[in-house]
């Protein structure tokens, strides 16, 4: 069971990143699915290595004081959403913006029907060029 | 099937990074090989988690306007080389140069004879000290 | 065999990061253990994908000239400690400090009783908020 999906620019104002099965994507079988273009949902309980990479372009003066944060989040059936992993990068002083890349990854137990998704502080700063921003998992 | 190889400084003017089976490297068996010191080639079709880490030292004034970009690339038999993953980091204002590390990783389907390699915008900026720059894969 | 442990603030002046089985941690079975809150120790020989993520907050003026370095280290029975992976990030000019995240990961052969741990140049700069700093492994 494995998946690798590719970032998709979105007009939605949500902080949840959107993904697509496009380009050089992976969707090994129907035991993992991409739902609503926003979350990877697994049908089997077990340990999964889950990862995300986010490239973004921001400028200190044009952004809030707070850093750019990418969060890998979990929603299990009948449970609250919770944060599994986070990474933070202070905005660049480069103009018009400075690119930076974040990588998140870890091993987590997922229940049947559990979904994982990626949140960012400012989706408008995310780079959607080929290969820059992606999201995936593999079952151990 | 798994491999982990270590960066090697090169006098070549190519943007493709060079690697060696040295130090604490891994080469599990002959189903994955390091070819010409530049690419990991697999003999078996299947899903692989492929990763690379690149540490570099650069300065904004001494570098081009463009960011430092590391790309994980694929060459399949009878196909074009193509980019699987990219990460970008704007150059530091630190002098003489500021170090930064990039990590790339994802799950991809590889065909028999497929090769993966790592490209960077400026190989002269790459750090080759112990553990700073490496490249590997594992078959799921 | 898999583990994922969560960073723990420590009053110790050591450069070795401390970890805990808390929050959304993973400890698959007793073939991998967290020892003294500082190292993951494995009982079985084999290939492991080992990873660490460290988020830190630092300022160029308040820090040493040297960059922030995170190192993934190995201690095998009857052997010297050695560095497997390192990442380096120059300190930010942001005030009071600028956050940055480092991700390390690679495939390594471990012997029975081998331990892996994470060293940083300045543990006081490490961010221990939920999900920011973690450490884990999985057996292939």
């Amino acid at each position: 069971i494995a998946a690798h999906v590719i970032s998709e620019a979105s007009s939605k104002t949500t902080s949840v990143l959107q993904w697509a099965e496009k380009g050089y994507y992976t969707m090994s079988n129907n035991l993992v699915t991409l739902e609503n273009g926003k979350q990877l949902t697994v049908k089997r309980q077990g340990l999964y290595y889950i990862y995300a990479q986010v490239t973004f372009c921001s400028n200190r003066e044009a952004s809030s004081q707070a850093p750019f944060i990418a969060s890998l989040c979990l929603k299990s059936p009948g449970r609250f959403e919770r944060i599994l992993l986070r990474a933070a990068n202070t905005h660049s002083s480069a103009k018009p913006c400075g690119q930076q890349s974040i990588h998140l990854g870890g091993v987590f137990e997922l229940q049947p029907g559990a979904s994982v998704f990626v949140n960012v502080t400012d989706p408008s700063q995310v780079s959607h060029g080929t290969g820059f921003t992606s999201f995936g998992l593999l079952k151990l | 099937i798994a491999a982990h190889v270590i960066s090697e400084a090169s006098s070549k003017t190519t943007s493709v990074l060079q690697w060696a089976e040295k130090g604490y490297y891994t080469m599990s068996n002959n189903l994955v090989t390091l070819e010409n010191g530049k690419q990991l080639t697999v003999k078996r079709q299947g899903l692989y988690y492929i990763y690379a880490q690149v540490t570099f030292c650069s300065n904004r004034e001494a570098s081009s306007q463009a960011p430092f970009i590391a790309s994980l690339c694929l060459k399949s038999p009878g196909r074009f080389e193509r980019i699987l993953l990219r990460a970008a980091n704007t150059h530091s204002s630190a002098k003489p140069c500021g170090q930064q590390s990039i990590h790339l990783g994802g799950v991809f389907e590889l065909q028999p004879g497929a090769s993966v390699f790592v490209n960077v915008t400026d190989p002269s900026q790459v750090s080759h000290g112990t553990g700073f720059t490496s490249f590997g894969l594992l078959k799921l | 065999i898999a583990a994922h442990v969560i960073s723990e603030a420590s009053s110790k002046t050591t450069s070795v990061l401390q970890w805990a089985e808390k929050g959304y941690y993973t400890m698959s079975n007793n073939l991998v253990t967290l020892e003294n809150g500082k190292q993951l120790t494995v009982k079985r020989q084999g290939l492991y994908y080992i990873y660490a993520q460290v988020t830190f907050c630092s300022n160029r003026e308040a820090s040493s000239q040297a960059p922030f370095i995170a190192s993934l280290c190995l201690k095998s029975p009857g052997r010297f400690e050695r560095i497997l992976l390192r990442a380096a990030n120059t300190h930010s000019s942001a005030k009071p400090c600028g956050q940055q995240s480092i991700h390390l990961g690679g495939v390594f052969e471990l012997q029975p009783g081998a331990s892996v741990f994470v060293n940083v140049t300045d543990p006081s700069q490490v961010s221990h908020g939920t999900g920011f700093t973690s450490f884990g492994l999985l057996k292939l």
Partner: nanobody, 118 residues
Framework: EVQLLESGGGLVQPGGSLRLSCAAS????????MGWVRQAPGKGLEWVSM????????YYADSVKGRFTISRDNSKNTLYLQMNSLRAEDTAVYYC???????????WGQGTLVTVSS
């Protein structure tokens, strides 16, 4: 059903230019890499060029680098190949292709003939 319809071929003198177009239907065009393949008389198939779904990365065979430019308009489901400085050896049937690596399978159009001759 996947359909790829090429147009724009014809007879051109050496050094001349042509622009090929490919109208795609039956699939979500913007999700797939697209490319051009050619077959010269009596020869095998040769990949000429490929473009990623976002249109930001392009790949070319050494034989056409610097002379051919691939592009796409995802809003119109159309792929293009601008061919400049044409040579006799570029004479071939040019096929538009939906480039796919999982599963390992490509869809082709019917092709358009390009003849470079004085």
């Amino acid at each position: 059903e996947v359909q790829l319809l090429e147009s724009g071929g014809g007879l051109v003198q050496p050094g001349g230019s042509l622009r090929l177009s490919c109208a795609a239907s039956g699939f979500t065009f913007q999700m797939y890499p697209m490319g051009w393949v050619r077959q010269a008389p009596g020869k095998g198939l040769e990949w000429v060029s490929m473009i990623e779904p976002a249109g930001d990365l392009t790949y070319y065979a050494d034989s056409v680098k610097g002379r051919f430019t691939i592009s796409r308009d995802n809003s119109k489901n159309t792929l293009y190949l601008q061919m400049n400085s044409l040579r006799a050896e570029d004479t071939a049937v040019y096929y538009c292709a939906k480039y796919q690596e999982q599963p390992w399978f490509d869809y082709w159009g019917q092709g358009t003939l390009v003849t470079v001759s004085s």
